[in-house]
């Protein structure tokens, strides 16, 4: 695994091929999670930020930017969208959490919570995922669509199997995240496919 502290994945072009596979041995279904990362893009169209599919299940967990100021979370093919006033283009720190027992999903943008939404109460997110950055999967690890591809930079990505309390979300935003047990930017197992370059993070 690699410590990517102070670095980002750069996706320099629109494509249907360029992506990064994130590898995790997630063995049991997710009842809760929190995902945090930084992103910087000047795309004004819709694009995928984090695509998590399981065998036979599309959009099992997907973080998707619909347009400037609109972030969507898909859980088990169901979707909620939260809105925020944001500058464009500008770097952003995104956290999203979801809790099965209540169905509550919450985005945090640059350390600020958006309006809570609810979806898929009681659902468990399937384990053994294919996780892709840079493309939106329409199958298990493939079937990409150029029009949903990400162009820009992604870094500081962490994923926990719990809903983090606000103080821990703020710690992640401020650059001092808790150790993460699903994906951890400081100990990341990944595969680069296509034209993706690792570069220093210069925009925080």
């Amino acid at each position: 695994h690699t410590d990517l502290s102070g670095k980002v994945f750069v996706f320099p072009r629109e494509s249907v091929t360029d992506h990064v596979n994130l590898i995790t041995p997630l063995e049991k279904p997710l009842q809760n999670f929190t995902l945090c990362f930084r992103a910087y893009s000047d795309l004004s169209r819709a694009y995928s930020l984090f695509s998590y599919n399981t065998q036979g299940r599309d959009n099992e967990l997907l973080v998707y930017k619909e347009r400037v100021g609109e972030y969507s979370l898909y859980i088990g093919r169901h979707k909620v969208t939260s809105k925020v006033i944001e500058k464009f283009p500008a770097p952003v720190h995104i956290c999203v959490s979801w809790e099965s027992s209540s169905g509550i999903a919450e985005f945090w943008i640059n350390g600020t919570p958006l309006v809570k939404k609810g979806l898929r109460q009681g659902y468990f997110v399937e384990a053994q995922p294919k996780i892709v950055l840079g493309q939106e999967q329409d199958s298990y690890g493939g079937k990409f669509d150029r029009s949903q591809s990400f162009v820009g930079e992604i870094g500081d990505l962490y994923m926990w199997d719990s809903v983090l309390p606000p103080e821990n979300i703020l710690s992640a935003y401020q650059g001092t995240p808790l150790p993460a047990n699903i994906l951890d930017w400081q100990a990341l197992n990944y595969e680069i496919r296509g034209y993706v370059i690792i570069k220093p993070l210069v925009w925080v």
Epitope: H1, T2, D3, L4, S5, G6, T24, P25, W160, D161, S162, L178, P179, N181, D184, Q186, A187, N189
Partner: antibody, heavy 119, light 107 residues
Framework: QVQLVQSGAEVKKPGSSVKVSCKAS????????MHWVRQAPGQGLEWMGM????????NYNEKFKSRVTITADKSTSTAYMELSSLRSEDTAVYYC????????????WGQGTLVTVSS | DIQMTQSPSSLSASVGDRVTITCKAS??????VAWYQQKPGKAPKLLIY???YRYSGVPSRFSGSGSGTDFTLTISSLQPEDFATYYC?????????FGQGTKLEIK
């Protein structure tokens, strides 16, 4: 099979420093966080800090931050832990340990190095 | 720092006994707990990770459970080689912290 081999026992005077080494073999040293844990005689385990040899990123337990320095030499696959301003309470066995592939647990340990602080 | 409190601190048991050791965290650590076994003069060995997963090569008589603040290590049928000291560890927050240990002795 990964192995961690530590340097030998040390006897030190109060106020001095000690530097313990931990040499890795049989694996990719630079890809794993290396941790240091100590154990005073008859006591429990205490995490001191960690280093990632590739990035040279470190993280220390605040309790030791002012006195401990963890370094790594990729060319020799060796991690080091230096503890300064030694006092009698620092008498302990010092272990290096490797982070597991996917989780923040320690799956490979060195054999330990006894550091005795005595005037 | 998160305190990990083990109980009992020592325990006498016989070969074949079922033994349970508990570990209580001072705050929620989710399932981010490991259990280690240590024999005198030796380094600790990883037994259980993520509260309930047996590490590679660990006999099936060892099992772990719990989440949040309360965790349990169970040895279903004690073998002679199991007499040792057992430690829990949390890796939910920095600094990582260990319990004070439970010494398992032969009755």
């Amino acid at each position: 099979q990964v192995q961690l081999v530590q340097s030998g026992a040390e006897v030190k005077k109060p106020g001095s420093s000690v530097k313990v080494s931990c040499k890795a073999s049989g694996g990719t040293f630079s890809s794993y966080w290396m941790h240091w844990v100590r154990q005073a005689p008859g006591q429990g385990l205490e995490w001191m800090g960690m280093i990632h040899p590739n990035s040279v990123n470190t993280n220390y337990n605040e309790k030791f931050k002012s006195r401990v320095t963890i370094t790594a030499d990729k060319s020799t696959s060796t991690a080091y832990m230096e503890l300064s301003s030694l006092r009698s309470e620092d008498t302990a066995v010092y272990y290096c340990a490797r982070r597991n592939d996917y989780y923040w647990y320690f799956d490979v340990w060195g054999q330990g190095t006894l550091v005795t602080v005595s005037s | 720092d998160i305190q990990m409190t083990q109980s009992p601190s020592s325990l006498s048991a016989s070969v074949g006994d079922r033994v349970t050791i508990t570990c209580k965290a001072s705050q929620n650590v989710n399932s981010n707990v490991a259990w280690y076994q240590q024999k005198p003069g030796k380094a600790p060995k990883l037994l259980i990770y993520s509260a309930s997963y047996r590490y590679s090569g660990v006999p099936s008589r060892f099992s772990g459970s719990g989440s949040g603040t309360d965790f349990t290590l169970t040895i279903s049928s004690l073998q002679p080689e199991d007499f040792a000291t057992y430690y829990c560890q949390q890796c939910n927050n920095y600094p990582f912290t260990f319990g004070q240990g439970t010494k398992l002795e032969i009755k």
